[in-house]
């Protein structure tokens, strides 16, 4: 049986392909005949499914580029908070228990996300192997206001999160130390195993495997919401917006942002992945009577999709007697 293939490297050249290269085993123990390449999609960190990204002032946005990781914090203009009423000077409010808890969760969130970055870029390797060379991501923490009261994490189980392991595929590579794996999902992590096989493979089997982890590049437009946004009137000056989720997103969709308004789209609503999975859309409440437009944008592991075309809807004024009694 030959020894394992050496120096396995993988890089992504597109959103659906990975190029894999390696060197022959140091001990072929006979005539080297072929290699077996196996690949398997890796599940996302469960935290990414459970975490409510709407509850944070900061959300991970990954920009795909060569180079090192750059975790940058972009802060908004400080909000002026009047703590002592109109007459009193502005002062630092004492932290509530809820705020202390939020800070603790923020630290946990940051730790998990940084682990995610580290594991998806600086990939784990077998002992004494060279580090994988692959394209990596610059990371920006982008800040935006979140109009939500949802909890930081959800206990509800996402069907995808239950998927502990995905099907694997195998291919035989003859007479070369390189292959291109196709038909992959965008911005998704794969484990690639390679066995070296010699003339006695049928009888004695091939080598143990050497492996590498690699992530495909993001796909342009993969996070765009397909198809139309629709709406339904609801009681109490509210409406329900529905939209289809991106079919094959970059990694997974973390949240959606709705911008809406009557004159200008100046109001924002954040819809977490978990809320969308539960309701298939979002309810906009406390709307004044009138005509509105709304647009929706998905945010995935690799960044933002495009805003949808505007959907036009209206909220009717309550008529006559109904208005009078209110």
């Amino acid at each position: 049986v030959p020894s394992i293939p050496l120096d396995v490297l993988s890089a992504s050249n597109s959103s659906s392909q990975l190029i894999v290269k390696w060197n022959p085993p140091s001990l072929p123990n006979g005539n080297l005949s072929y290699y077996i390449v196996r690949w398997q999609r890796q599940p996302q960190d469960g935290y990414l499914y459970r975490h409510n990204y709407c509850s944070k002032d900061k959300i991970p946005i990954r920009k795909y580029a060569d180079g090192t990781i750059d975790i940058e914090e972009v802060t908004e203009n400080p909000k002026t908070e009047v703590c002592g009423g109109e007459k009193g000077p502005c002062c630092a409010c004492p932290k509530t228990e809820a705020e202390k808890q939020a800070e603790k969760e923020e630290a946990e969130y940051r730790k998990v996300f940084e682990n995610f970055l580290h594991n998806s870029i600086f990939v784990p390797r077998p002992e004494r192997k060279r580090r994988d060379v692959m394209q990596v991501a610059n990371t920006t923490m982008s800040s935006r206001s979140r109009n939500t009261t949802a909890a930081d994490t959800y206990n509800i189980t996402d069907p995808e999160e239950l998927e502990t392991e995905y099907p694997f595929f195998e291919s035989r590579v003859d007479n070369k130390e390189r292959t291109v794996i196709s038909n992959l999902r965008p911005f998704t992590l794969y484990r690639i195993d390679i066995h070296s096989c010699n003339h006695e493979a049928e009888k004695l089997g091939c080598s143990a495997s050497n492996f590498v982890f690699a992530r495909t590049m993001p796909a342009e437009g993969a996070d765009d919401i397909p198809g139309p946004v629709t709406w339904e009137p609801r009681p109490e000056n509210s409406i329900f917006l529905k939209w289809p989720e991106p079919e094959n997103p970059n990694g997974l969709i973390l949240m959606y942002e709705i911008k809406y308004g009557s004159q200008v789209e100046d109001q924002r609503e954040c819809v977490s992945r978990q809320e969308y999975r539960k309701y298939g859309g979002a309810k906009l409440n406390r709307l004044n009577p009138g005509n509105y437009t709304a647009r929706i944008q998905a945010t995935s592991l690799s960044g933002n999709g495009s805003w949808t075309d505007p959907v036009f809807f209206y909220v009717q004024a309550k008529t006559g007697y109904e208005n009078f009694i209110h």
Partner: antibody, heavy 117, light 107 residues
């Protein structure tokens, strides 16, 4: 030439057990994942189970979970399906198959299992 | 579990006809779809994988297309040996599932 030769089928009573075998030749069996698929008489195909090349990972269809066990003996180049607590609805032709770059590229000839009282 | 709905279930056609079979997935499966041909008393044979890649040794009159939830298998000019049952299969996630089959019969 890749060959998957199946054996072990037969007629058994409900509640009993049976073990199917799939002997592989013509390829490096111990480096490949393997699947079982079944087909009830006059019906469509149903995936049953998968085992990784080294036997470390196994997955089953809900309909057989807890009753069937997929295993392999790499020294004998043989795949097995141990079927316990058999039911009438397990009556089918059972196939072993190898996985390729995107589908089951090699199949055994099939072996018929009939569960009847 | 992902359900695959094949249509039609039965199809009568003549030699030389262009035949199209569709397979609809209950949720998006990207391009993780394979097509098989099965003749009575025989094991299935892989025709197409990754939705559109022709398996080695399969005649070029067979072609596959689609991604996400809608897929088609097309036989451009039906030959006598093509009368058989055709199945689609999703390999996106466990449990792997098959469509109900389409039987192509001689008209």
């Amino acid at each position: 030439e890749v060959q998957l030769v199946q054996s072990g089928g037969g007629v058994v009573q409900p509640g009993t057990s049976l073990r199917l075998s799939c002997a592989a030749s013509g390829f490096s069996f111990r480096s490949h994942g393997m699947h079982w698929v079944r087909q009830a008489p006059g019906k469509g195909l149903e995936w049953v189970a998968v085992i990784s090349y080294d036997g470390s990972n196994k997955y089953y269809a809900d309909s057989v979970k807890g009753r069937f066990t997929i295993s392999r003996d790499n020294s004998k180049n043989t795949l097995y399906l141990q079927m316990n607590s058999l039911r009438a609805e397990d009556t089918a032709v059972y196939y072993c198959a190898t996985i390729g770059p995107g589908g089951f590229d090699y199949w055994g000839q099939g072996t018929l299992v009939t569960v009847s009282s | 579990d992902i359900q695959l709905t094949q249509s039609p279930s039965f199809l009568s056609a003549s030699v030389g006809d262009r035949v199209t079979i569709t397979c609809r997935a209950s949720q998006g499966i990207s391009s993780y779809l394979a097509w098989y041909q099965q003749k009575p008393g025989k094991a299935p044979k892989l025709l197409i994988y990754a939705a559109s890649t022709l398996q080695s040794g399969v005649p070029s009159r067979f072609s596959g297309s689609g991604s996400g939830t809608e897929f088609t298998l097309t036989i451009s000019s039906l030959q006598p040996e093509d009368f058989a049952t055709y199945y689609c299969q999703q390999l996106n996630s466990y449990p792997l599932t098959f469509g109900g089959g389409t039987k192509v019969e001689i008209k």
